[in-house]
């Protein structure tokens, strides 16, 4: 679809005569008839196959034609066509004299013709005007012409229809050849595909408008390049969605089991050395002078009653010191200057000479001890604390410091290891002599039933087209991560490529 435009510029008829040579009375009131038709080697009468147009009276005898002439005429003259421009044409321009106001062909005498010109040739579509001048013996006509495409038609023949649009069926303008030129941010054959945010992950992200990055299930972050770990994952990371790979020192399905209590909580006091011994379990090795589960108790070195023979013990900065009773000496008052003659044995103990009377030994009655039977039997010597408890003398009494897992005056009571519900996923806990045992429900195993052994939802390979399958451990379902070009919950549908333009 296009328009053949003819611009009349000047008509010269100096003598004011008709083609017959007869003069016009009072002058030649001139109008034009134009016929546009298909190319003919010799232009002949016949149908104006490409169209016709007439002007009103434009002037008398000789005159210049102004653009968009008054009197209802249009200059340039428009000859629209609704077909592919063939590139060739024939043009007939007739100048007529109008004696009256009726310009219809049937209302004019045949001899009212002033002049007739006929041209033919090639003409390409374009904005440039072709200037021409035709002269006969009595008249001269100067004009120019061109062919341009109608609005929304493009190409060498005005055959390509293209309408700019900016809606969801395309975001483009039209190039001179009728091809689409996408608006910024859009791509694809119809410019309907948005260009996502720069760096948006090709598989894990997508967009519905330019510079956007929306994440597919299992991915997050500005560019959808960060996987989402398993729901409830505490101290872990992922490299693919729904994983929970534990950070160092953490274990269990959700990486919430502390395997490095020493580092995370520093429970040992007073410079003691901490050793991890299981989940939330540790052992403190105390420095000299300290005791307790966490080495939190300062230990008096006199507590072990190191002074013998009734010597009294005094704590010092760097240890202890024994004050010996008369007749004794040595670091622990262990040496005697007495003999049996001095009756050194107390509490009914019997004295026995040694080394020809240079020394002696006391045989003590029950409940007494010491080299002179001066001490009541140490309540701790009989190891009254069960289950490896530590016995501590406290003046007239004693106390047992129990190992973890035991309680009672003599550490004789076993604290139930099951009390803190250590078995995961509904496992049943059984107390044993030296620990506990978990009986796991179907689908779980491991010391604490922490290992999932249920049927892998991905085992049946439910994802198509080489998609990656991820098991959602919380629901025993699967998620398919589709490769580029496929969609659907199982990636079963190919993303169809739009067919090319029909032209």
């Amino acid at each position: 679809s296009g328009v053949f435009q003819l611009q009349l510029q000047e008509f010269i008829n100096e003598r004011g005569v008709l083609a017959s040579g007869r003069p016009c009375e009072p002058g030649c009131r001139t109008f034009f008839r134009v016929c546009l038709k298909h190319f003919q080697a010799v232009v002949s009468p016949g149908p104006c196959t490409f169209g016709t147009v007439s002007t009103p009276v434009l002037g008398t005898n000789s005159f210049a034609v102004r653009d968009d002439s008054s009197g209802g005429g249009r200059n340039p003259l428009q000859l629209p066509f609704n077909f592919t421009w063939p590139g060739t044409f024939s043009l007939i321009i007739e100048a007529w004299h109008a004696p009256g106001d009726d310009l219809r062909p049937e209302a004019l005498p045949p001899d009212a013709l002033i002049s007739k010109i006929a041209i033919q040739g090639s003409l390409a579509v374009g904005q440039n005007w072709l200037l021409d001048e035709q002269t006969s013996t009595l008249t001269r006509l100067r004009y120019s012409y061109r062919v341009i495409c109608s609005d929304n038609y493009y190409g060498d023949n005005c055959s390509r229809l293209c309408k700019k649009r900016n809606d969801h069926f395309g975001h483009y303008v039209c190039q001179p050849d009728g091809n689409l030129s996408c608006l910024p941010g859009w791509t694809g054959e119809y410019c309907q595909q948005p260009i996502c945010l720069s760096g948006c992950h090709e598989q894990n992200g997508y967009c519905s408008k330019p510079a956007e990055c929306l994440c597919r299930p299992g991915w997050q972050g500005r560019l959808c390049n960060e996987c989402i770990p398993h729901n409830g994952c505490r101290h872990g990371t992922c490299s693919t969605p729904w994983q929970c790979t534990c950070d160092e020192g953490w274990g269990g399905l959700f990486c919430d089991q502390d395997l490095n209590y020493c580092t995370h909580h520093s429970p040992c006091k007073n410079g003691a050395t901490c050793s991890n011994s299981g989940q939330r379990s540790y052992t403190c090795t105390c420095r000299p002078g300290y005791t307790g589960v966490d080495c939190e108790l300062e230990l008096s070195e006199c507590d072990s009653n190191p002074c013998r023979n009734g010597g009294s013990c005094k704590d010092q900065e760097d240890g202890y010191h024994c004050l010996c009773p008369p007749g004794y000496y040595g670091l622990h008052c262990e040496h005697s200057t007495l003999s049996c003659a001095d009756s050194p044995c107390f509490n009914g103990g019997s004295c026995r000479e040694r080394n020809q009377g240079a020394n002696y030994a006391c045989e003590c009655p029950p409940n007494f001890t010491g080299s002179n039977c001066e001490k009541k039997v140490d309540r701790c010597t009989s190891n009254p604390c069960a289950n490896g408890g530590q016995c501590l003398n406290r003046g007239p009494s004693r106390m047992c410091r129990c190992r973890p897992g035991f309680t009672g005056t003599y550490c004789e009571l076993h604290v139930s290891d099951c009390a803190r519900n250590p078995c995961a996923h509904g496992g049943t806990c059984h107390d044993l002599e030296n620990g506990l045992m978990c009986t796991c429900p179907a689908g779980f195993s491991g010391r604490r039933c922490e290992v999932r052994t249920s049927i892998d939802a991905c085992a049946s390979s439910p994802c198509f087209n080489r998609a990656t399958c991820y098991t959602d451990l919380s629901t025993d379902t699967f998620v398919c991560n589709c490769p580029y070009g496929f969609v659907g919950s199982r990636c079963e549908f190919p993303v169809g490529l739009p067919p090319s333009f029909p032209w």
Partner: antibody
């Protein structure tokens, strides 16, 4: 050949939500060449475009209805759905689902047979 | 909002040419589709992108669009062409239908 089939209740009470589903058979809803639309026609009246959706989830709605309309897509079931909230008697119409083809400049070349929804208490 | 106006009805004798107009502001700058709807049936696309015919649509259906007016022409009209005809265009992101023309 692609076929579209609307389904949903034929009677909805005023102020409630109208819900319809269109099932696509004989072709994939995930093709990049199409939008999937809803059009309605009150008894004895003309056609009114409600909105449409692309398989990736982009939606477009008639401005006069957009506060009440939600269109969604389920590619795994090859279906798309319409929800119209706070309905009144004026929403009584035959509801059509249709395929809008990008290659045809958005022309709807495939239509369902339509389902009449009456809004009445 | 954008509006498309159609004459309510057009009458034509069999074998004659029927012309249905659809007018809207600068409609020639938009692509127009035409739909035929017979009583009790779903609409059928007969013209897209102003003047293109989908496969299966008879050649007697043609379309044009310029200025503010699009026209659907049925030449050599047959009795089976009696139906309602709707024009449709896209304005921004919304579809707009004409009011419809009954061809008898």
């Amino acid at each position: 050949e692609v076929q579209l089939q609307e389904s949903g209740p034929g009677l909805v009470k005023p102020s409630e939500t109208l819900s319809l589903t269109c099932t696509v058979s004989g072709g994939s809803i995930s093709s990049s060449s199409y939008y999937w639309g809803w059009i309605r026609q009150p008894p004895g009246k003309g056609l009114e475009w409600i909105g449409d959706i692309y398989y990736a989830g982009s939606t477009y709605y008639n401005p006069s209805l957009k506060d009440r309309v939600t269109i969604s897509v389920d590619t795994s079931k090859n279906q798309f759905s319409l929800k119209l909230s706070s309905v009144t008697a004026a929403d009584t119409a035959v509801y059509y689902c249709a395929r809008e083809d990008m290659i045809l400049g958005g022309g709807a070349d495939n239509w369902g047979q339509g389902t009449l929804v009456t809004v009445s208490s | 909002s954008y509006e498309l106006t159609q004459p309510p009805s057009v009458s034509v004798s069999p074998g004659q040419t029927a012309s249905i107009t659809c007018s809207g502001d600068r409609l020639g700058d938009k692509y127009v589709s035409w739909y035929q709807q017979k009583p009790g049936q779903s609409p059928v696309l007969v013209i897209y992108e102003d003047s293109e015919r989908p496969s299966g649509i008879p050649e007697r259906f043609s379309g044009s669009n310029s200025g503010d007016t699009a026209t659907l022409t049925i030449s050599g009209t047959q009795a089976m062409d009696e139906a309602d005809y709707y024009c449709q265009a896209w304005d921004s992101e919304a579809g707009v239908f004409g009011s419809g023309t009954k061809v008898t």
